[in-house]
């Protein structure tokens, strides 16, 4: 025998005070499938959390983070405080990078700049500590047309290249 | 040479989905950052996903974030763009890009640019 | 509305130079690289400039970039009619956590 609830469709769930038959989800509560014998209760964005996308009979509200903030973990089930370009978020706040670390983003952690010589290749430019050193072409690569290597200027304090 | 290859692109009506796929040769695919970046007819270059190869990470223009998804299988050396809740203002011609800077010896590879480009897909979004 | 600010066009004579300038803010050009791409009419664009300045290679030296603050400059000396080309702008911006271009600028060689 088929199972009647297998007739509910989404935003719906079978209502077994009612016979099996299907009853629309209540108010802040939702089914993305059919044949539910329950409604799901919808997510609530509050405090850090706002809201991207409402709850609909079928589908669940999405969250992101108020200005300031980033989303973390899977349907932005977290917000992290957002630092500035050239800095990492440590438990005491936004810290600097230090000399020879760099972080251009305004989440994640301070990496070291790129060592070129890994790559048989020169600094092309200088790191800062917003910004990554740029490896120059190995002598191999350059050909008429493409910049020549210079020799980077000495950084004018630590973490900065002149501009 | 590096080649890139576009496709799925084609007439959808609004609301619908549309999955794009850029098959890559000519360099080591699971080296580098890779970008779609779309132009509507007449209109500016606007850059619309970037994904990394080493950590996975996605960004997305504030236009699409929520309705788009790219990723990468590195085994076949092909980059998506799984597009959802279409509207007018996405139809546009769709370029894959590789960027600068292979990883992860290259720690960011914003310095070095988009140096490859494919030819495009289109996408027209209409009822 | 873009991000960085190009004129939206640029012309001069062969032989002559002309510059193209783009604007922006601290969060994307101020601390971050400005590449530049050229685009032939009805072709996909072309990294034309990297790291503010530098050339890949093929690309002629009468390309020339170059960045002051939150703005940067592309040079074009001994224009060519094979030149005339939309000219676009691009960086990183921190605050966006994406890549952001200008509108683009047309140039036009004239005569």
């Known amino acids: 025998l088929q199972d009647p609830c297998s007739n509910c469709p989404a935003g719906t769930f079978c209502d077994n005070n009612r016979n099996q038959i299907c009853s629309p989800c209540p108010p802040n509560s939702f089914s993305s499938a059919g044949g539910q014998r329950t409604c799901d209760i919808c997510r609530q964005c509050k405090g850090v959390f706002r809201t991207r996308k409402e709850c609909s009979s079928t589908s669940n509200a999405e969250c992101d983070c108020t200005p300031g903030f980033h989303c973390l973990g899977a349907g932005c089930s977290m917000c992290e405080q957002d630092c500035k370009q050239g800095q990492e978020l440590t438990k005491k706040g936004c810290k600097d990078c230090c000399f020879g670390t760099f972080n251009d983003q305004k989440r994640g952690i301070c990496r070291p700049w790129t060592n070129c010589s890994l790559d048989g290749k020169s600094v092309l430019v200088n790191g800062t500590k917003e910004r990554d050193v740029v490896c120059g072409p190995s002598p191999a690569d350059l050909s008429p047309g493409a910049s020549s290597v210079t020799p980077p200027a000495p950084a004018r304090e630590p973490g900065h290249s002149p501009q | 040479e590096v080649q890139l290859l576009e496709s799925g692109g084609g007439l959808v009506q609004p609301g619908g989905s549309l999955r794009l796929s850029c098959a890559a040769s000519?360099?080591?695919?699971?080296?580098?950052?890779m970008s779609w970046v779309r132009q509507a007819p007449g209109k500016c270059l606007e850059w619309v996903s970037v994904?990394?190869?080493?950590?996975?990470?996605?960004y997305y223009a504030d236009s699409v974030k929520g309705r788009f998804t790219i990723s990468r299988d590195n085994s076949k050396n092909t980059l998506y763009l799984q597009m959802n809740s279409l509207r007018a203002e996405d139809a546009a011609v769709y370029y894959c890009?590789?960027?600068?800077?292979?990883?992860?010896?290259?720690?960011?590879?914003?310095?070095?640019?988009?140096?490859?480009w494919g030819q495009g897909t289109l996408v027209t979004v209409s009822s | 509305q873009s991000v960085l600010t190009q004129p939206p066009s640029a012309s001069g004579t062969p032989g002559r130079r002309v510059t193209i300038s783009c604007s922006g803010s601290s969060s994307n050009i101020g601390n971050n690289y400005v590449t530049w791409y050229q685009q032939l009419p009805g072709t996909a664009p072309k990294l034309l400039i990297y790291a503010d300045s530098h050339r890949p290679s093929g690309v002629p030296d009468r390309f020339s970039g170059s960045k002051s603050g939150t703005s940067a400059s592309l040079a074009i000396s001994g224009l060519r009619s094979e030149d005339e080309a939309d000219y676009y702008c691009a960086t990183w911006d921190y605050s966006l956590s994406g890549y952001v271009f200008g509108c683009g600028t047309k140039l036009t060689v004239l005569g």
């Open positions: 000519g360099f080591t695919f699971s080296g580098y950052d």
């Open positions: 890009a590789k960027h600068g800077g292979q990883k992860p010896t290259t720690k960011s590879s914003s310095a070095y640019g988009m140096d490859g």
């Open positions: 994904i990394y190869p080493d950590d996975g990470n996605t």
